[in-house]
Interface confidence: low
């Protein structure tokens, strides 16, 4: 049995007057079903006179009645062609057709802009059967229209593999202007021209644009959207926005800040990360960038010693990572360090100067006049040397390091001795007989170990030999060390 659907008790009174065949708009339909995926129930209809012919697709029935009269062509009745309404309002529209009852398996589907509307749309199809014909009304409702609902809607019906298409119903949703392009924040050079763009659309069209700078309108006459504002140049920061007007009212874009590029602020918090004898690692916090990216930074270094000539060393580096290792500095020296950074406009002032010191350096000169003796009676080697001349920045002498290497057939062994700073002689035990002992000495400060002296060799004979003369480094300017035995 056919049951009445819950959706509606009566058809919508969408048509002026009765349908052909005495079907009144207040008749209750036998069946009213929500449209889903194009499916409709198959019903037997009985024919009656069709409505006005349709300008779109029609289906010419090839079947004849009992009296052999040809059936008239099928077509959707004309309905409203263009609906204009405001955003968020509700709308209902429909298409209708009268179908002879000889046709089975009729389906009506809704299409928008060439695509079938499936799923969760409020589409309802109502059937009004008569003896010979069934009037079908397909209604489509939108409870709160949005701009995306704008478009051309049609009904399609398939009968016996024939497709019947209704006239389009154009839905035009009107509302306040909608921005498709808003001005963007910019950082600009002082007194240099730049452009801002604003574009908004309806419907309704046209959309007119007013520009606003710091709360005051720039143009007295509106420009049609899209609008490009050419600002000849600014001397100080300004905020711009645009107003879009149409018949429904006005919409205001976001306000965008146009900043004037300036030289950066000086870096802050310059600090010492690490110091060695000849380098200092510094870091800094960049100042405000003046609305233009930092390009590079300059580290300025001057000796803090009042007796220095006041010359400034300059080291250039990239702006990131706010770290720089200053190299080639003197040991045990005081320096003033400042940092300046630049953007496309120019250099910042120098940061507050900070004081930094390098640590002691290692000695730069080896001990002089190294002499080596063999003391056979005590089975020792005596070593003597002269303290090297030290520079102040090499730091305080804390001692000496002695390297002695023992070499005989198949054996080579290096030993190291540490000697206090006051001595200028040392005694080491003979490690191997019938071997060569090679001695080198280096001075040591807190800054490290200096260079080793030239090697001095002495032969240590097997037990029982006599006559041992000293070995020594040559006087300055002489050739290689001489071994005297």
């Amino acid at each position: 049995a056919i049951t009445e659907a819950r959706e509606e008790a009566k058809p919508y009174p969408l048509f002026p007057g009765p349908f052909p065949g005495s079907l009144q708009t207040d008749h209750t339909p036998l069946l009213s079903l929500p449209h889903a995926s194009g499916y409709q129930p198959a019903l037997m209809f009985s024919p009656t006179q069709p409505g006005r012919p349709h300008t779109g697709n029609v289906a010419i029935p090839q079947v004849t009645s009992v009296e052999s009269k040809p059936l008239p062509p099928l077509a959707f009745k004309h309905t409203v062609g263009h609906i204009i309404l405001s955003e968020h309002k509700g709308v209902k529209f429909n298409c209708s057709i009268s179908v002879p009852n000889i046709y089975q398996d009729t389906t009506i589907s809704w299409w928008k802009d060439g695509k079938e509307l499936l799923g969760a749309h409020h589409a309802i199809t109502q059937f009004y059967p008569d003896d010979e014909v069934t009037a079908i009304i397909a209604s489509f409702s939108i409870t709160s229209v949005q701009r995306s609902d704008n478009g051309s809607y049609i009904c399609k019906m398939k009968i016996n593999n024939e497709e019947i298409v209704s006239d389009p119903i154009y839905i035009e949703v009107q509302g306040l202007p909608h921005f498709t392009k808003q001005p963007e924040s910019m950082n600009v050079t002082r007194n240099t021209a730049f452009n801002l763009t604003c574009q908004a659309v309806g419907p309704p069209e046209p959309v007119n644009i007013f520009w606003v700078q710091n709360s005051s309108r720039v143009n007295e006459q509106p420009e049609k959207s899209p609008s490009v504002l050419t600002v000849p140049g600014l001397t100080e920061m300004a905020v711009f926005s645009c107003e879009a007007h149409n018949d429904k009212g006005l919409t205001v874009s976001k306000g965008v800040q146009i900043n004037i590029k300036a030289i950066p602020s000086p870096p802050t918090e310059v600090s010492i990360r690490n110091s060695t004898a000849h380098s200092i690692l510094i870091s800094w916090v960049p100042g405000f960038d003046g609305y233009s990216p930092f390009r590079n930074c300059s580290i300025q270094v001057k000796e803090a010693d009042p007796l220095s000539n006041g010359s400034v060393m300059i080291f250039n580096t990239s702006a990131l990572p706010h770290l720089y290792q200053i190299k080639q500095l003197q040991a045990l020296a005081n320096y003033s360090i400042g940092v300046s950074c630049m953007n496309e406009i120019g250099w910042s002032a120098v940061s507050p100067w900070i004081l930094a010191s390098t640590t002691e350096g290692a000695p730069s000169v080896a001990p002089l006049n190294v002499t080596v003796f063999l003391n056979e009676s005590s089975d020792n080697v005596d070593i003597r040397w002269m303290k090297p001349p030290t520079k102040q920045q090499d730091g305080e002498l804390v001692g000496y390091r002695i390297s002695h290497v023992w070499q005989s057939a198949g054996i080579s062994k290096e030993l190291l001795e540490e000697v206090g700073q006051n001595g200028s002689r040392a005694r080491i035990s003979v490690q191997v007989h019938n071997a060569t002992c090679t001695v080198r000495i280096a001075a040591v400060t807190r800054g490290g170990v200096g260079p080793f002296s030239d090697p001095v060799k002495i032969f240590i004979p097997a037990h029982g030999w006599v006559d041992y003369a000293p070995s020594s480094t040559p006087a300055p300017g002489n050739a290689d060390p001489v071994l005297i035995i």
């Epitope: 924040s185 800040q257 900043n259 802050t268 918090e269 600090s271 990360r273 870091s283 916090v285 960049p286 100042g287 405000f288 960038d289 609305y291 990131l320 706010h322 770290l323």
Partner: antibody
Framework: QVQLQQPGAELVKPGASVKLSCKAS????????MHWVKQRPGQGLEWIGM???????NYNEKFKSKATLTVDISSSTAYMQLSSLTSEDSAVYYC???????????????WGTGTTVTVSS | DIQMTQSPASLSVSVGETVTITCRAS??????LAWYQQKQGKSPQLLVY???NLADGVPSRFSGSGSGTQYSLKINSLQSEDFGSYYC?????????FGAGTKLELK
């Protein structure tokens, strides 16, 4: 004096979203980074991310799909939208400000009052 | 990401005592460290920035020290208003991370 005002509390259902606000006053809003920090009940502090009205945003990778930071320059207000909320998101959320344009100077001398977000059905 | 390991997790002390809280970074953060105090139900407050600098209005009994990866906050002669939680935070690049906190309780 510099102030960051935040609503006291928000009660939201699991799966929903919430948009927290932080209204700044007493300083030039467009010159400073605004940071957001999360603190779960009885727990420590977690940095969510930061936004500069004139520059851009920088998120903690952990919160990239959870938080969206925006600003409204006209009202000097920063916003953080939290999406797909679960009980793990129940926490106090603070906004906090520090100095402008300083890559390595992001400590916070001014904190908001904090908004307590409770996620419960 | 840089991990900040704070210790101890809690500390029971009396007024007048001196306490030291430490914070260890998983890598060198070059003194880019801040300390905060947070009282129950309140927002955190900055105490120390750049490892050693006292923030405006912070009493001189607070002091920060350290470099590299090891940092500490010292509170001399603890006052009753000093009880609460303390957090360290590095700002050597993003993401910024905080220590888990140290809760200072009255013995």
């Amino acid at each position: 004096q510099v102030q960051l005002q935040q609503p006291g509390a928000e009660l939201v259902k699991p799966g929903a979203s919430v948009k927290l606000s932080c209204k700044a006053s007493g300083y030039t809003f467009t010159s400073y980074w605004m940071h957001w920090v999360k603190q779960r009940p009885g727990q420590g502090l977690e940095w969510i991310g930061m936004i500069h009205p004139n520059i851009n945003t920088n998120y903690n990778e952990k919160f990239k799909s959870k938080a969206t930071l925006t600003v409204d320059i006209s009202s000097s207000t920063a916003y953080m939208q939290l999406s797909s909320l679960t009980s793990e998101d129940s926490a106090v959320y603070y906004c906090a400000k520090r100095s402008p344009y300083s890559n390595y100077d992001w400590y916070f001398d001014v904190w908001g009052t904090g908004t307590t977000v409770t996620v419960s059905s | 990401d840089i991990q900040m390991t704070q210790s101890p997790a809690s500390l029971s002390v009396s007024v007048g005592e001196t306490v030291t809280i430490t914070c260890r970074a998983s890598e060198n953060i070059y003194s880019n460290l801040a300390w905060y105090q947070q009282k129950q139900g309140k927002s955190p407050q900055l105490l120390v920035y750049a490892a050693t600098n006292l923030a405006d209005g912070v009493p001189s009994r607070f002091s920060g020290s350290g470099s590299g990866t090891q940092y500490s906050l010292k509170i001399n002669s603890l006052q009753s208003e000093d009880f609460g939680s303390y957090y360290c935070q590095h700002f050597w690049g993003t993401p910024l991370t905080f220590g888990a906190g140290t809760k200072l309780e009255l013995k």
